[in-house]
Each structure stands twice: as C-alpha cells, then as structure tokens.
C-alpha cells in the first residue's frame, strides 16, 4: 500500500477519504485506526455502525467521525478541531470476522495556520509518477506517495 498524505490546519476540520471496491467489500464494516509505534499495532479509533445497512450514519468517537458510502465505495473520516497531536499514521480498514484488510494508509499532517503556508500547494505539487487528489476540504491537501517513500510499519 502507498501512504497518502492528508494535510489540514489546526483548529479546523479535515476529511480523509478512502476509496474501495464496493463489491469486494460488500457487507463489511469499516474502521479507522492509528498506528501506535514503529512496529506496534493499529489501535481502533472509530468504526462504522454495527449494522452494515446503517453504515451511512455518521458515528463519532470524541472528535473523530466515520461514515461509509457502501454503494459508491468511499469511506470518509472527519477529524474535527484538528490539533498537532492528531498528526501521525493511520489506516482505513475493512473488517471481516477478527481480520482487517487495509484499504488505505494515511499520514495526517497538521499545519499551524493557513496564512503562514500559502506556498504549501507549491511544495506538495506532485511529480509525474505521483497521483494528486484534492481532499475537497478547505485548507486540506492529499497526495499519494510512492511505495517506499515512507516506511509504514506492519500491522498486527
């Protein structure tokens, strides 16, 4: 899996989107977890509704929300009131039994103030070998990194 960077601004909300094959993951609940250490487990932050048919309902855990468009195949995580401590490595997961498949590996990056980072778009403009994807959230940017650019620890 590549690691995708989502960049947000402290005090604002950040939306992270995780696309997936809706047929392959039909009937599966989803989850958002945070990598705890270099080789540590991925700790569950929030998961979709216990009833898969109600996955479209937004579920909150603290300042983090999750909602799943099961037909369109997009899992959306909202981090409200983003702060420096939210920065780090996360995963979108598809759950089946006690197992979890990784849908996307994510690096959340938190900036101090949008006016202080007017050049962020220039800094993050991708090269030809990279895909760029707008996160469609004010002051947020996402960018896929090439495999190997960021070593992501294995999940347990």
């Amino acid at each position: 899996h590549n690691t995708t960077v989502f960049q947000g601004v402290a005090g604002q909300s950040l939306q992270v989107s995780c696309p997936y094959d809706s047929m392959k993951h039909w009937g599966r609940r989803k989850a958002w977890c945070r990598q705890l250490g270099e080789k540590g487990p991925c700790q569950r932050v929030v998961s979709t509704h216990n009833l898969w048919l109600l996955s479209f309902l937004r579920r909150w855990n603290g300042s983090t929300a999750i909602t799943d468009d099961t037909l369109g195949g997009t899992l959306t995580i909202t981090l409200r009131n983003l702060q420096p401590h939210d920065a780090g490595l996360y995963q979108c997961q598809s759950l089946h039994g006690s197992e979890a498949d990784t849908l996307r590996k994510v690096l959340v990056e938190v900036l101090a103030d949008p006016l202080d980072h007017r050049d962020a778009g220039d800094l993050w403009f991708p090269g030809e070998s990279e895909s760029f994807e707008d996160a469609h959230v004010e002051h947020s940017i996402s960018r896929s990194l090439l495999e190997g650019e960021i070593p992501f620890p294995p999940t347990s």
Partner: antibody, heavy 120, light 107 residues
Framework: QVQLVQSGAEVKKPGASVKVSCKAS????????MHWVRQAPGQGLEWMGW????????NYAQKFQGRVTMTRDTSISTAYMELSRLRSDDTAVYYC?????????????WGQGTLVTVSS | EIVLTQSPATLSLSPGERATLSCRAS??????LAWYQQKPGQAPRLLIY???NRATGIPARFSGSGSGTDFTLTISSLEPEDFAVYYC?????????FGGGTKVEIK
C-alpha cells in the same frame, strides 16, 4: 543506530544569517519529520518548527515566521535551518530532533547541537 | 500559547531516594505530554510520551502520570546518572512548548 550530526559552531554579526545543517543516518530520512529546537545559554527549550523531508512541507512557530527557513536535501539525508536578521537574543544552541511518523510531535532522537553566537 | 510550569525548580536528593517532579499546564493538554532529560553539555533525551509511555530503552524506574493540566514524572530510586535537568513538553496545540525545567541535584 539513529544518528543526527550537526554542523559546527558559528559566530555571526547582528543582521546576518546563519544556516545550520543536520545529517541523518541509521533510518530512512524521508520517513520522519525533522524539528528544530533552540536553547539560549542557561535557559529552557524553544520549538522553532518542522520540515517533512519527504515533501519539503514546513510548519514554523509564529514567533519565527518570516525569519526561519527549513529545507532538506534528500540525496544526502540532510536537513537545514536558516535563520535570518540575527539579533543578540538569537544566541543559542540549535538542535535538530527527529519526529517519528507515528508520533510526529515528539522528539525521539536529537542532534548534538550547534552553538550560534550573535555578537557585534 | 500553553504555558507549562514545572516545580520545584530544583530538587536536592540523594541516590536511592524517590524523585517526584511536577508539570502544570495553563490549559488542558489531555494526555499529550512528554518528558525529557538533559545533562550538562548534552542534547535532551526522550523519557516519556503520551504522559505515561516510556520511550525505547528507558529504565522502568522512570514513570509518568497525569492528564489534563497536572502531570508527574517519578524516578522511583535515583541512580547517579539520573541527576540532570528534566523538561516537560506539550504537543496538544501549536506552538509546541516546554516547561522551564526541574534540576535534580545531589544532596
């Protein structure tokens, strides 16, 4: 093992600029943030900002905005911190410190420090 | 800006004694607090993160506790190499800030 080796001491005049380097080894340079923290003589620690070596993206403490520039050269696994318009109260030891990606705002490894003296 | 106040400024103890260092935040930082040790002429070293998690290679005699605004670093039995200055750091909000430090000196 992780090592951060910084450039040597500098003496600068007020109004000048200084550029401190920090060479990383023992880990994937683009796989962690690099922070810069300074410590005035006999004083506490003051965070200046960070750079993501993978993207070059930066985030500076408001106090240093407009005076500090953090850059990197991934080909030689080296981060740089340049501070301009130096004043006497910029005299300090400047440290680079690694922020691991899983917890980017803690500083798990530090350079040995670079003393920058600003004096006329 | 979150202000971290450390107390006492200096702690005079003997090897083998228990050291209790305090760090108080001007507003809640939840559990987003780290502790560092700094010896003269050296760079700081990470001891504790997330208020209570020991960093890699840190001896079990170091422990951290607290949440919200009040935090404690405890050294259960001081070793000769533990006499140093200790700083707390919050990573809850920008700018990241440090406390003024507590010096643990030999009595």
């Amino acid at each position: 093992q992780v090592q951060l080796v910084q450039s040597g001491a500098e003496v600068k005049k007020p109004g000048a600029s200084v550029k401190v380097s920090c060479k990383a080894s023992g880990y994937t340079f683009t796989g962690s943030y690099m922070h810069w923290v300074r410590q005035a003589p006999g004083q506490g620690l003051e965070w200046m900002g960070w750079i993501n070596p993978n993207s070059g993206g930066t985030n500076y403490a408001q106090k240093f905005q407009g005076r500090v520039t953090m850059t990197r050269d991934t080909s030689i696994s080296t981060a740089y911190m340049e501070l301009s318009r130096l004043r006497s109260d910029d005299t300090a030891v400047y440290y680079c410190a690694r922020g691991p990606l899983y917890h980017p705002m803690i500083f798990d490894y530090w350079g040995q420090g670079t003393l920058v003296t600003v004096s006329s | 800006e979150i202000v971290l106040t450390q107390s006492p400024a200096t702690l005079s103890l003997s090897p083998g004694e228990r050291a209790t260092l305090s760090c108080r935040a001007s507003q809640s930082v939840s559990s987003y607090l780290a502790w560092y040790q700094q010896k003269p002429g050296q760079a700081p070293r990470l001891l504790i993160y997330d208020a209570s998690n020991r960093a890699t290679g840190i001896p079990a005699r170091f422990s951290g506790s607290g949440s919200g605004t009040d935090f404690t670093l405890t050294i259960s039995s001081l070793e000769p190499e533990d006499f140093a200055v200790y700083y707390c750091q919050q990573l809850s909000t920008y700018p990241l800030t440090f406390g003024g430090g507590t010096k643990v000196e030999i009595k």
